[in-house]
Interface confidence: medium
């Protein structure tokens, strides 16, 4: 039988009455246009909803928008359009919500053609009040907050000027012209690229990379011949044009661009691209596109300096620059990532790594599923996960995979069971151990969300017809209850719950349609009375993450340490609560050669864990330079994998070698850098 229909599924007592008392409907007095929703702050209960409706007239498009505010997690909304003087808000800029709990909101208004500049509405009290400010420029991008100080904003203008505000958008100053891309770094630093001649597009590959650490008082040119740049973790990356041809290479800096090293990565041609898939303070996953229009490339993982790279995964699906990749960080378990590869026969297969890209494997076939038509052997196949690529291809996949850091081990995703991703209608699968094992959770496509740190999972069927039923599970998707939240079905458009999965409220968004009218409507359901009591110590059980062989003393060791978590028992129906903190007990593992990667000039022969010196370095395609100048590379051939905490055990110490290596190219060397002040 389907999951949730088994005899042993116990029902949550009196849940219909409990949920009915906690279901709140709000009908918006709106024609159905588009709706966008933003949470303001963490655990504040404040939601802003912007509805926009375009009326196409003969000569122009007339727009109308309304702004609503809730301060009780969406149970009730108040029309606050008058606070923004009934102005039409530009949805393409969205609602710029300030970092952390700053309570700051910026809305960008539509202005008439001949105006000198744009207009914004600013709030610093969680949208209780707004101040109208006329800008001295027309914004090209949404206002960007400094992560360190929410009073500092930057924006690019339609004329490629870089504008900065130091008082939350009250006053603006143009600090540089001819700017292509600008990003906040750490410590209120701004990095940006500039063009000298024609335009951003014309000067691609001849841009300069600049830095200001004092909001535009002084500048330093930290790179030339730049194609693009990116920030990831503590790394600053720049792709730089080669001197002789049209290829470019990645350079990396860990000191905000003062010194650079060439990354040991292949160079790419005009039609290719680099992409930072994921980065933290330890390391980076980098995708390097294959030559030609193949739709795939190679994933490399870096060392702790971002310089030496190990090949992690071949034939990694990534369609084009800014295109689709299924690369997903499973945030509910350390070291786990899921992505797709394009196999030789052009089929797409899902791969998973549990050790931060060290090894990739197929996903284990769910126990309660049979192999589909893509499988050659009906008894041997894998689970394949639908993510961004499937969604872009308009498969019946309403949602990407979902995991939450505080819902330990839980991963929910659409998938199919076979030799490759299938075009057939997918089902929803769940893993409770970070992707090692999977179970079919729901039949057919669904929207899903995690509440109360995993204590409740909520789902709504992805249907062609209006819906009025929501499903929920209190045991990590094993058993499901259904609740009819309204007598009158609605055309469903989305599920909304507070980011962070700590809330017990879910909002169901949709619209009602009759012969003449069509209105937005939301239903907010509070599950607090389903989870009647607070969880106690007895409700939790000890769980060893990454456990595959309990007999092995090193069981659970990943990146040099193992972690035991306190996990809520599936049978416990109780509240983790908003203040729930994941309890984990780490213990250090003994080192093995697996905890080390091969340093520059060394490699691992196949089926061998030892690093062997490369016989020939001269003319090697992956040359690189340390700190932007000639350098004695001293190495014993091994470097500990970034983030690896192992101690004792194998210590691969051997004679330290000097690899005298001439820098053949370093376009970002210090002598090419300069400083200037405004």
């Amino acid at each position: 039988s389907a999951p949730g229909e088994d005899e042993e599924c116990g029902r949550v007592r009196d849940f219909v009455a409990k949920l009915a008392n906690n279901t709140h409907q709000h009908v918006f007095d709106d024609l159905r246009g588009s709706v966008s929703l933003s949470w303001v702050g963490d655990s504040t209960g404040v939601i802003l909803v912007l509805t926009t409706f375009h009326v196409p007239l003969v000569i122009m498009t007339f727009g109308q928008s309304k702004l609503y505010r809730s301060e009780d997690y969406g149970k009730n909304f108040k029309d606050i359009t008058d606070l923004i003087n009934n102005t039409f808000i530009r949805t393409e800029f969205g609602m710029a919500i300030g970092p952390e709990n700053s309570g700051k909101v910026v809305l960008t208004a539509e202005v008439s053609g001949g105006s000198r500049g744009g207009r914004i509405f600013r709030s610093s009290d969680f949208a209780k009040n707004f101040v109208q400010t006329d800008l001295p420029f027309h914004p090209l991008t949404q206002m960007m907050y400094s992560p360190q100080n929410s009073d500092y904003l930057l924006a690019l203008s339609t004329e490629n000027g870089l504008w900065v505000s130091k008082n939350f958008g009250g006053k603006w100053e143009e600090i540089h012209k001819a700017v292509c891309l600008a990003k906040w770094g750490s410590d209120n630093t701004i990095f940006f690229t500039t063009y000298a001649n024609g335009s951003c597009k014309a000067d691609l590959g001849a841009l300069e990379l600049w830095r200001t650490s004092d909001l535009g008082k002084s500048f330093k040119t930290i790179g030339v011949k730049i194609y693009s740049f990116g920030l990831g973790g503590r790394f600053l990356f720049a792709s730089v044009m080669a001197d002789k041809d049209t290829t470019r290479r990645i350079h990396v800096s860990t000191d905000q661009g003062d010194t650079w090293s060439m990354a040991q990565l292949p160079s790419v041609g005009q039609e290719q691209f680099y992409s930072i898939l994921a980065a933290n303070d330890d390391m980076v996953f980098m995708h390097v596109d294959e030559p030609g229009d193949t739709g795939f490339g190679t994933i490399f993982t870096s060392d702790d300096r971002g310089i030496v790279y190990s090949k992690s995964l071949d034939r990694h699906l990534y369609t084009t620059t800014g295109g689709e990749t299924d690369f997903t960080n499973v945030t509910s378990l350390r070291g786990v990532y899921i992505t797709s590869v394009l196999s030789e026969d052009n089929s797409i297969q899902t791969m998973i790594t549990f050790d931060q890209g060290g090894r990739w494997t197929h996903l284990r076939k769910p126990e309660n599923s049979e192999c589909d038509a893509t499988a050659k052997n009906k008894n041997e196949c894998s689970l394949h996960i639908h993510a961004s690529y499937s969604i872009s291809q308009k498969l019946n996949v309403p949602m990407a995979p979902l995991s939450e850091p505080n819902a330990v081990g839980i991963v929910i995703a659409h998938g199919s069971v076979g030799d490759a991703i299938s075009v057939m209608v997918p089902d929803v699968y769940i893993s409770d151990d970070g992707g090692y094992s999977w179970t079919k959770m729901l039949e057919g496509p669904h929207y899903y969300t995690i509440l109360d740190s995993g204590g409740i999972i909520v789902a709504i069927e992805h249907s062609s017809r209006p819906i009025n039923v929501i499903k929920f599970s209190t045991d990590e998707g094993q058993c499901w209850q259904t609740y009819t939240f309204t007598r009158d079905p609605i055309y469903f458009t989305g599920l909304a719950s507070e980011p962070g999965a700590r809330s017990m409220n879910i909002s169901i968004w949709g619209f009602t349609e009759s012969f003449l009218t069509s209105q937005w409507v939301s239903y907010t359901i509070d599950f607090k009375d389903i989870l009647e009591r607070n969880c106690e110590e007895k409700d939790y059980t000890i769980w060893l993450a990454h456990s595959t062989d309990p007999e092995d003393y090193e069981d659970g060791c990943i990146l040099g340490y193992k972690e035991q978590f306190l996990r809520l028992r599936k049978s416990s129906v109780c509240q983790n609560g908003r203040d729930y903190v994941v309890t984990k007990q780490p213990s250090i593992c003994l080192c093995s050669l697996e905890d080390f990667l091969c340093d520059f000039g060394y490699y691992r022969p196949e089926n061998d864990s030892k690093c062997v010196e490369q016989p020939e370095l001269k003319g090697h395609d992956l040359e690189f330079c340390l700190y932007g100048r000639e350098e004695h590379l001293t190495t014993n051939g091994y470097r500990k994998i970034p983030g690896d905490k192992c101690q004792g055990g194998v210590n691969p110490v051997r004679e330290v070698k000097d690899l005298k290596k001439k820098c053949t190219s370093n376009f970002l060397s210090p002598e090419k850098q300069n400083s200037k002040s405004n």
Partner: antibody, heavy 129, light 107 residues
Amino acid sequence: QVQLVQSGAEVKKPGASVKVSCKASGYTFTSRYMSWVRQAPGQGLEWMGIINPVGGSTSYAQKFQGRVTMTRDTSTSTVYMELSSLRSEDTAVYYCARDPSGIALAGPASRGYYGMDVWGQGTTVTVSS
Amino acid sequence: EIVMTQSPATLSVSPGERATLSCRASQSVSSNLAWYQQKPGQAPRLLIYGASTRATGIPARFSGSGSGTEFTLTISSLQSEDFAVYYCQQARLGPWTFGGGTKVEIK
């Protein structure tokens, strides 16, 4: 109007291959999958496989695995079905059929399985020595 | 694969009468089921999709019901043009499969 026009009848010898074309018009070719269905004389309908015109990915029924190849040419909005190693029991009318099969169409009420809503006129393939 | 079984194989009905056709799936296909009508020498024509939704241009006398494993196609008052073969088809799990068909003939 939306239509699928298939190539003409074919007579083939056992062991040979046949390639049937199906040209789509009246809608955005890449917005729908295409299924192939065959019907032997006096028999019921048999699904052979499906192709996604966007990426060209395919899924074939186990019975035809290794013998069937479905391809598409987006420049001419045409899908092709090639069946190799023909035998007498492959004598049938072959249909292409537009198949949403899970494509989320534009608009809110456009999800789920919509059935094969447009069919080609059929191509008769006779396998005889 | 999911096996679709239609019954009866032949149904003899007089014009104006009600016809009820049954389709059973070997496992749940949810509501991923379609019904087709086929007349001699013609391609099949979609009647019902999503188990119960009439396709564009299909008269109201055709209705579909059911979910999971049991499905029914009902023709409330048979017209002369309704005498044909009817097939059900699931699109729940690959490969798509059709039922063997029910021939509706004049009594």
